[in-house]
């Protein structure tokens, strides 16, 4: 971790200590410099782990809607188009930092909050475990 | 998509406009609970896409530590352990949001902001283009 | 200047499939996800599905039983809404509308003008 | 699926009234959104999350209610008020609209 040198211009803040507060300018910069051409929305047919997109949705949070995956075979698609199962279709997670409103209801105050969201799915060779 | 009903013991907020400054408290809660069994750290040397985890760091972004997925090959593993340049290995990508320190090195005041990341890598069927 | 600007009217042959485009401009294209909502002739509202740009997902009313698909070009910020199996019942005015994917309480707070979609024989 | 039912369906009503139409959801919901709409013209969010009005809409609208019902009050009816209402809720798959109720000059 890195020690920051506090900015003159930054606002007051006498409580250093955690839990803190802070100021979130909720103006959303968006870091993606053009739309990436190689990033693909159709992966999720395309893949031999193929997966569905699920919406959820819960006003409480920032953002208020998630779409979730759920792969759609315990097994992977083969070069026929069937389902081996052999192979093992599983979901590839990630813990992502949310906004929960806190107090409940309130416009302007939130308080950060962890969560473990399915991304996408990827095929993978099952542990097999050998009985003695 | 649910309002909200205001509630009377929220911080008051006169301007309702974007772009909007919340207060937000960092001490994170985290909804996962307890680990997720199922959840494997190993798929990213199973898959049939491998990656590697890079160690993304940036003082200025809340969280400061990203893990990014590079998938190890363009091709895809098959079931002799080859790599099968018939089928490609591609990142799944997830935009999530993260704060950036605004103005910079200030401890206690942040913008939202939209980053692009690769969370792990999943085995596609190529977009074969054909000239006539 | 927010506007989501849709394709012009459609005349159809009961069987057939419509596609109708609602072109977003004025503001980014994957911060919102675009509903579609349609209006038989002197009738309430109908809400027929979603598409999130974003993620590619895709959420429909399961009324329309599979014969609906919405999709999305971010590279033109585009969504599409293709009706198939078109009956006499179908005939009516269809509308995109965005909807905020970080505070869902805005609700659908811009609309496309419509395309009237007309099914007859 | 959520039934929304609009009282009344249509109602004559003179510049200066005070007008309340209620919208009755066959189970509860979180909030209730209402727009208006004019002959020929895309529908227009007029107030959401029960409560707040959308950006232009005059202060006379106002919205309230929980549970299973709610309603639009407009203090004192105008010239341009004038249209058709539709409440919708969100809570619960699919989303529906009420069947609208259609505000005439007395």
């Known amino acids: 971790g890195i020690t920051i040198p506090r900015n003159p211009g930054c606002p007051n803040s006498e409580d250093k200590n955690f839990p803190r507060t802070v100021m979130v300018n909720l103006n959303i910069h968006n870091r993606n410099t053009n739309t990436n051409p190689k990033r693909s929305s159709d992966y999720y047919n395309r893949s031999t782990s193929p997966w569905n997109l699920h919406r959820n949705e819960d006003p409480e949070r920032y953002p208020s809607v998630i779409w979730e995956a759920k792969c759609r075979h315990l097994g992977c698609i083969n070069a026929d188009g069937n389902v081996d199962y052999h192979m093992n279709s599983v979901p590839i997670q990630q813990e992502i930092l949310v906004l929960r409103r806190e107090p409940p209801h309130c416009p302007n105050s939130f308080r950060l909050e962890k969560i473990l969201v399915s991304v996408g799915c990827t095929c993978v060779t099952p542990i097999v475990h050998h009985v003695a | 998509g649910i309002t909200i009903p205001r509630n009377p013991g929220c911080p008051n907020s006169e301007d309702k406009n974007f772009p909007r400054t919340v207060m937000v408290n960092l001490n994170i809660h985290n909804r996962n609970t307890n680990t997720n069994p199922k959840r494997s750290s190993d798929y990213y040397n199973r898959s049939t896409s491998p990656w590697n985890l890079h160690r993304n760091e940036d003082p200025e972004r809340y969280p400061s530590v990203i893990w990014e997925a590079k998938c190890r090959h363009l091709g895809c593993i098959n079931a002799d352990g080859n790599v099968d340049y018939h089928m490609n290995s591609v990142p799944i990508q997830q935009e999530i949001l993260v704060l950036r320190r605004e103005p910079p090195h200030c401890p206690n005041s942040f913008r939202l902001e939209k980053i692009l990341v690769s969370v792990g890598c999943t085995c596609v069927t190529p977009i074969v283009h054909h000239v006539a | 200047e927010v506007q989501l600007v849709q394709s012009g009217a459609e005349v159809k042959k009961p069987g057939s499939s419509v596609k109708v485009s609602c072109k977003a401009s004025?503001?980014?294209?994957?911060?919102?996800?675009i509903h579609w909502v349609r209006q038989a002739p002197g009738q309430g509202l109908e809400w027929m599905g979603v598409n999130d740009p974003e993620s590619g997902g895709t959420f429909y009313n399961q009324k329309f039983d599979g014969r609906v698909t919405i999709t999305a070009d971010k590279s033109t910020s585009t969504a599409y809404m293709e009706l198939s199996s078109l009956r006499s019942e179908d005939t009516a005015v269809y509308y995109c509308a965005r909807y905020y994917r970080y505070e869902s309480f805005y609700g659908m707070d811009y609309w496309g003008q419509g395309t009237t979609v007309t099914v007859s024989s | 699926d959520i039934q929304l039912t609009q009282s009344p369906s249509s109602l004559s009503a003179s510049v200066g009234d005070r007008v309340t139409i209620t919208c009755s959801a066959s189970s509860s919901i979180s909030y209730i959104y209402w727009f208006q709409q004019k002959p020929g013209k895309s529908p227009k969010r007029w107030i959401y999350a029960t409560f707040e009005l959308a950006s232009g809409v005059p202060s006379r609208f106002s919205g309230s209610g929980s549970g299973t019902d709610y309603t639009l009050t407009i203090s004192s009816l105008q010239p341009e008020d004038f249209a058709t209402y539709y409440c919708h809720q969100r809570s619960s798959y699919p989303w529906t609209f009420g069947q609208g109720t259609k505000l005439e000059i007395k």
């Open positions: 004025g503001y980014t294209f994957t911060d919102y996800e």
